[in-house]
């Protein structure tokens, strides 16, 4: 029977800069029941606080709700593991909410084949930003990436769409069924998961771009 091994805070993520969650990996338990607590203070302050919510983020997590989240301050946090034989502490982690944003996937993806009479046909892809993100405040710039491939193909074709919420693709294989998805990321932060997908059948008379 031993003191617990050193835990590690391995990830912090925020869906929208308004809340965030951090997760830790326990060390060895030393063969005894082990309690974990996360404590933090804000840079420039000495007052230590305990994690406000161990439930929302699931096992081995700490969730910071709106009232505990500040964009303009760095959080310095550590996890304490304690059993009957002693304690161990994780390394301190410095967290700036601005840099840990991972949005939810974009919504409302829809894809249509457009065949104007006077121009080349194209694939028109449209989507909406995730609902948790308020782009009107100007705090956020979301960038989008599209991936598509013929249904049976192994390789995805990637297109960067910038800040647009719609995109045109001209070069496609006639007669193929394509799978299309979109994801987003803030200017600082992480890519979202890929959105739910859309299958689209490209007509046989779709003319490839020159």
């Amino acid at each position: 029977q031993l003191p617990p091994g050193k835990p590690e805070i391995f990830k912090c993520r925020s869906p929208n800069k308004e809340t965030f969650t951090c997760w830790w990996r326990p060390g060895t338990d030393g063969g005894l029941p082990t309690n974990y607590s996360l404590t933090y203070h804000r840079e420039g302050e000495t007052l230590m606080h305990e994690c406000p919510d161990y439930i929302t983020g699931g096992p081995n997590s700490c969730h910071f709700g709106k009232q505990y989240t500040s964009m303009w301050r760095t959080y310095i946090m550590m996890v304490n593991a304690t059993n009957q034989m002693g304690s161990s502490f994780s390394d301190e982690l410095y967290v700036d909410v601005t840099y840990i944003v991972q949005p939810d996937p974009p919504l409302e993806l829809a894809v249509e084949v457009k065949q104007p009479e006077d121009r080349k046909p194209y694939l028109w892809i449209k989507w909406s930003p995730p609902t948790l993100i308020d782009l009107k405040t100007g705090w956020f710039t979301l960038l989008y990436e599209i991936r598509l491939k013929p249904e049976k193909a192994a390789e995805w074709e990637i297109h960067f769409a910038g800040q647009q919420t719609e995109f045109k693709i001209l070069s496609l294989h006639p007669g193929q069924k394509y799978l299309v998805q979109v994801r987003c990321k803030p200017d600082h932060g992480y890519w979202s998961a890929w959105s739910p997908a859309t299958f689209i059948q490209i007509p046989s008379d779709f003319t490839m771009n020159d």
């Epitope: 939810d104 919504l107 409302e108 829809a110 249509e112 989507w127 909406s128 948790l132 739910p196 997908a197």
Partner: antibody
């Protein structure tokens, strides 16, 4: 209180075009993360998804029926219209409209209309 | 398009029984799987979404599990009002597809 109500003809002749209207209340067709879907169910058979339209006006259609279907919406009238061309007796079914909720890792039909039975017969 | 296969197509059970219905997708759909209940002459009603999230107002005897391609709807203790047809539906990729349904009948 969210409600959806389908309206349209109960009887159409083969080769004719069916036009169904879904009138909604309790939410707006322009609300982010909202949409309306059409689903049908032939007597004694399973549900079949036909089409949907999202708040951003994005549309999707059933692969097998795409060439016959058009979905559109009039946000101010709170209506979504589905048209289906070249009707055939096998299209006899109860046609439902339902609200789509899209959100954080979720996409589902949470409110349904009561359905309207459309019979295709000469 | 993704195919959804439900089993069994029908089952007979008694009040108080534990009932399990399975749904299999022809390819991975993450957790974008919804379950609906339909009674004769009525519109379907949402029970669960995103595989395991219980819709507001639905009794807790209904539960869902699974991700990827294999999903389960469980009714822990069947009640008289639960005799109905149940449908799974994937919303991972359009065109969306429903399972062919499972009819739960009184034994």
């Amino acid at each position: 209180q969210v409600t959806l109500k389908e309206s349209g003809p109960v009887l159409v002749k083969p080769t004719q075009t069916l036009s169904l209207t879904c009138t909604v209340s309790g939410f707006s067709l322009s609300d982010a993360g909202m949409g309306v879907s059409w689903i049908r169910q032939p007597p004694g058979k399973a549900l079949e998804w036909l089409a949907h339209i999202f708040s951003n006006d994005g549309k999707s259609y059933s692969t097998s029926l795409k060439s016959r279907l058009t979905i559109s919406k009039d946000t101010s009238k709170r209506q979504v219209v589905l048209t289906m061309t070249n009707m055939d007796p096998v299209d006899t079914a109860t046609y439902y409209c339902a609200r789509i909720r899209t959100g954080t890792y979720s996409l589902y039909l949470d409110y349904w209309g009561q359905g309207t039975l459309v019979t295709v017969s000469s | 398009d993704i195919q959804m296969t439900q089993s069994p197509s029908s089952l007979s059970a008694s009040v108080g029984d534990r009932v399990t219905i399975t749904c299999r997708a022809s390819q991975s759909i993450n957790s974008y799987l919804n379950w609906y209940q339909q009674k004769p002459g009525k519109a379907p009603k949402l029970l669960l979404y995103f595989a395991s999230s219980l819709q507001s107002g639905v009794p807790s005897r209904f539960s869902g599990s699974g991700s990827g391609t294999d999903f389960t709807l469980t009714i822990s203790s069947l009640q008289p009002e639960d005799f109905a047809s149940y449908y799974c539906q994937e919303s991972y990729s359009t065109p969306w597809t429903f399972g062919q349904g499972t009819k739960v009948e009184i034994k």
